[in-house]
Interface confidence: low
């Protein structure tokens, strides 16, 4: 007898996960025109593609890249030069420093003379020609041509005090989500940038042990909840004559400037019109300000009638961030996503005032991102299709028509394989790439922007498909459960030979942070996939109240009371899972990282007896210990006249006694710049004071991601042992 084909398949191993054996590829064209793009080949050549002529050639060889150990590149818009980036040195989530070399494509050699200093914090080309702006030692410099001497635009930059053109820690992580804070005007005439003054911000200091006799101390200006914040100013400089009048400061709207405020984003509308967004420190009021250049005054004017106010009465403004505007061709009207009267985030068209905004999309679903507005089309993503909040499809609205007609570009392309898309558009959307993340194998495709017809597959992960053929993957289900008028979406990962009549251990993986989403129709082969495949553990992820894309009522339920409903909803879901009949009630665990570590800790300390054990990796333990912009967005201020009481009530430490009847594994990196080790140190102290036994692991010199190869291997091996012991699974 021949063994059945199914028997030849093997389960995933932890090694598979740690080695990244089953990682997938995506393909994002680096657009350089309407129909041309660059892409770095697998052997590191930079290849030029013209979709229409089907021309393709190496614009920069891997040998040139290798000659300076370059890992990234950037082509100047006039196509005469390429910057090559090497010596990448990571700083925080987005920021890094690097060494930059300029390569002259016409002469086939590196530009000599006036070489760039090192390390540079940020560098970019102008949108036209080959001007260069860069940030070095917190100051901005300009080169009219790569071989020209640099012109210094700012002189105020000071380490850990004043940042020009790059954000400080809190703005990088919680507001801009970029490594830069400078923006060229479309014609390359003006350069706008932000100056962040951190002089009065308290410093977080932690040890970095390294290899030396004495540890180093890392100092970061880091405003925790209620602390002094950065002071921000926005400037614009004329780069044609930078020496002429120097940088011009852009005025802050009066209603914003009257109290503590944030700068939230900048969008160039035209060569002499710019749009700035500002936010009150109490983040329920956002102001969008449109400013114009007055040649006669050589100044930037932001008239009051060009200020648009967005306010939330039920929570905070925007989703995770306040949305940015997508301007029409007229450079006056724009499209923007904000909550409609029913509390669902939708696209609105603003011509004069926000009050007169025309709602473009509507329904009990949410518009998520506007990709591109052209003369006749608006492309956006939403989770409308078939009512699944965890899907993303791309839609086109024909804005020339009245009423506008809507078409789903992606809904039926590869319906089973692809339900979660993003897109990358050429300049005026003549062509675009679709990147599908799942639930099947990710695939990237190229499309005609007029007909939406697929032109080419860019990456379909054939190799991954082949290597997964002999793997027993778990079955993934996305369903919803109802409880007392609330609907909770969940993802369940079931072991390969799942049998409903049997009992399985259950692991809840939780994040649960405000405006997050865990239940997404995406492909993944990760640690929990392994736990289901090899160890026979049922995994569940549940999106409780506070999570995104299901309307403001659901989202804002957690406003000013973090740590309550997120936990309650995980517990509700666990009880429902038990009712399904295939969960072993004696073997239920929960784990989470960061916000998920906070929720898993509170769930373990809920006193319900539902959980046998759990793990918290790099948890927040008190919102007073976390960043001002984040904590205050959802919790208000930790002051007596605001929300201090709930700040104190919602700590993990306050529940130390309740850990007595669970097995708790607490893990943290000592060099965590984001959720400071302080958080876990305080949990440990509270548990010791309460004489509660627990397990702990620290990772020396590791940050919030605990991402170094050795540390990550150790971490997941350690957590696996802990779980298997908890579930009485043999090694």
């Amino acid at each position: 007898l021949r063994p059945s084909r199914g028997n030849t398949k093997r389960a995933l191993t932890l090694k598979d996960i740690l080695n990244g054996t089953f990682s997938y590829k995506t393909y994002f064209p680096n657009w350089i025109s309407e129909q041309e793009y660059l892409h770095q080949s697998e052997d590191d050549n930079i290849v030029f593609y013209n979709i229409e002529t089907r021309e393709s050639y190496i614009i920069l060889s891997n040998s040139t890249m290798k000659s300076v150990n370059a890992t990234d590149y950037g082509l100047s818009p006039d196509r005469q030069f390429v910057y090559l980036e090497s010596d990448y040195s990571k700083l925080w989530r987005y920021s890094y420093t690097a060494t930059y070399y300029i390569y002259d494509l016409q002469n086939g050699e590196f530009v000599r003379g006036y070489e760039l200093p090192r390390p540079i914090q940020y560098l970019c080309w102008s949108p036209v020609g080959s001007k260069l702006a860069y940030v070095y030692q917190n100051n901005i410099y300009l080169k009219q041509r790569p071989g020209d001497p640099p012109f210094q635009i700012t002189y105020t930059g000071r380490e850990n005090r004043i940042f020009n053109g790059i954000p400080d820690w809190v703005y990088e992580e919680e507001m801009l989500a970029t490594k830069y804070a400078l923006w060229w005007s479309p014609d390359g005439k003006f350069l706008a940038y932000v100056e962040f003054n951190d002089s009065d911000i308290p410093i977080i200091a932690y040890s970095y042990y390294g290899d030396g006799q004495y540890p180093r101390t890392i100092n970061i200006p880091y405003p925790k909840a209620g602390a002094k914040n950065p002071v921000v100013r926005v400037f614009i400089v004329d780069t044609t004559y930078p020496h002429h009048v120097g940088p011009m400061e852009v005025p802050v709207p009066e209603m914003i400037a009257s109290s503590d405020y944030y700068f939230s984003w900048l969008t160039w509308v035209s060569s002499e019109r710019v749009c700035l967004q500002w936010l009150k420190r109490v983040q329920n009021v956002s102001v969008l300000s449109i400013c114009d250049f007055r040649e006669d005054w050589h100044a930037w004017e932001c008239p009051k009638n060009q200020e648009h106010v967005e306010e939330s009465r039920t929570g905070w403004a925007g989703g995770f961030f306040v949305s940015t505007p997508a301007f029409s061709q007229d450079a006056t009207s724009y499209y923007k996503i904000f909550s409609d009267k029913d509390g669902y985030k939708h696209i609105h068209y603003i011509k004069d005032t926000v009050e007169n905004a025309i709602q473009i999309t509507s329904g009990k679903w949410e518009a998520i991102y506007i990709f591109r507005v052209t003369q006749d089309s608006l492309f956006y993503s939403s989770n409308e299709f078939e009512g699944y909040p965890g899907r993303r499809n791309i839609y086109r609205i024909s804005i020339g028509n009245s009423p506008p007609s809507k078409k789903c570009v992606t809904c039926h392309l590869r319906k089973e394989r692809c339900q979660y898309y993003t897109a990358s558009f050429s300049y005026k959307a003549k062509y675009y790439a679709l990147v599908c993340y799942g639930p099947g194998l990710p695939i990237s495709t190229l499309h005609d922007g007029r007909t939406d017809q697929e032109i080419q597959v860019l990456e379909e992960n054939k190799e991954l498909e082949n290597s997964l053929r002999n793997i027993q993957l778990p079955k993934v289900e996305i369903k919803k459960l109802k409880d007392g008028g609330l609907t909770f979406w969940y993802k369940m990962i079931l072991p390969p030979q799942f049998d409903r009549s049997k009992k399985y251990p259950l692991l809840i993986q939780v994040y649960g942070g405000p405006c997050s989403q865990s239940v997404k129709s995406v492909f993944a082969v990760n640690w929990i996939t392994y736990l289901a495949s090899k160890e026979g553990i049922v995994i569940a992820l549940v999106d409780g109240r506070g999570t995104a894309f299901q309307g403001d009522k659901f989202l804002h339920a957690v406003y000013r009371k973090l740590g309550v409903y997120e936990v309650e909803d995980q517990l509700t879901a666990v009880r429902k899972f038990i009712e399904m009949g295939f969960i072993d009630e004696e073997r239920i665990a929960i784990w989470g990282w960061s916000y998920g570590g906070y929720v898993s800790s509170l769930a373990l300390a809920s006193g319900t007896g539902l959980f046998k054990c759990g793990i918290a990796v790099a948890p927040v333990s008190s919102w007073e210990y976390y960043a001002s912009i984040y904590s205050e967005r959802f919790m208000g201020l930790p002051t007596k006249d605001d929300n201090l009481e709930h700040y104190k009530n919602s700590t993990v430490m306050a529940r130390a006694e309740y850990f007595r009847n669970v097995d708790y594994l607490l893990i943290h990196g000592t060099a965590d710049d984001n959720v400071h080790f302080q958080n876990s140190a305080q949990i440990a102290k509270a548990l010791v004071n309460a004489q509660v036994d627990f397990q702990a692991m620290w990772y020396s010199d590791q940050n919030h991601g605990i991402s170094s190869g050795r540390s990550q291997n150790h971490l997941y091996t350690h957590m696996t042992h802990f779980l298997k012991q908890c579930f009485s699974l043999s090694d």
Partner: antibody
Amino acid sequence: DVQLVESGGGLVQPGGSLRLSCAASGFSMSNFAMTWVRQAPGEGLEWVSGIRGSGTTYYADSVKGRFTVSRDNSKNTLYLQMNSLRAEDTAIYYCAKTWGTEYFDYWGLGTLVTVSS
Amino acid sequence: EIVLTQSPGTLSLSPGERATLSCRASQPINNYLAWYQQKPGQAPRLLIFSASNRATGIPDRFSGSGSGTEFTLTISSLEPEDFAVYYCQQYYDWPPYTFGGGTKVEIK
């Protein structure tokens, strides 16, 4: 201009071996998927083998285990090592550049392989 | 594997006439279809990709259409140099890439 030139064809006995070469100019082969397609006398086209930019190789069932595709990036040349040749392998063998991983945008003139005793 | 069936096997037409060649896939292949022209003693030449896009340098008398399982190559007005064998090829599901059996367009 893109050019592909095949060589190495000829008469070989059944069970014998042959190595075909395809020299490329006008583009760097290492960056693109390359393909071998054959055409038996008076017959249609049959895909034989392919190699991606990454070096991953693919074969038609009819040649799997007998043919090996490879590439020398420094010489910008593609190869097809053909072992255990059979009469039914008699064909003109074309080398072609693949656009992405889809269709074949540039072809060589072909080289004739005859397997006969 | 996906099987492509071309029809007719041979098409006898005069110069100036319109030629319509068909290619049917055994299962839907979206628009992942290419057409090639092969003249005697020559290598194939790419005519059409993605079912309807003309390759560089291909005269506009050649046009492709179709999606799913039914595809058509049309030559609006045959020129003497158009008499050749035409093949369709799918790249929806590979390996293997598969070709149709070919349609010979001959002078009547």
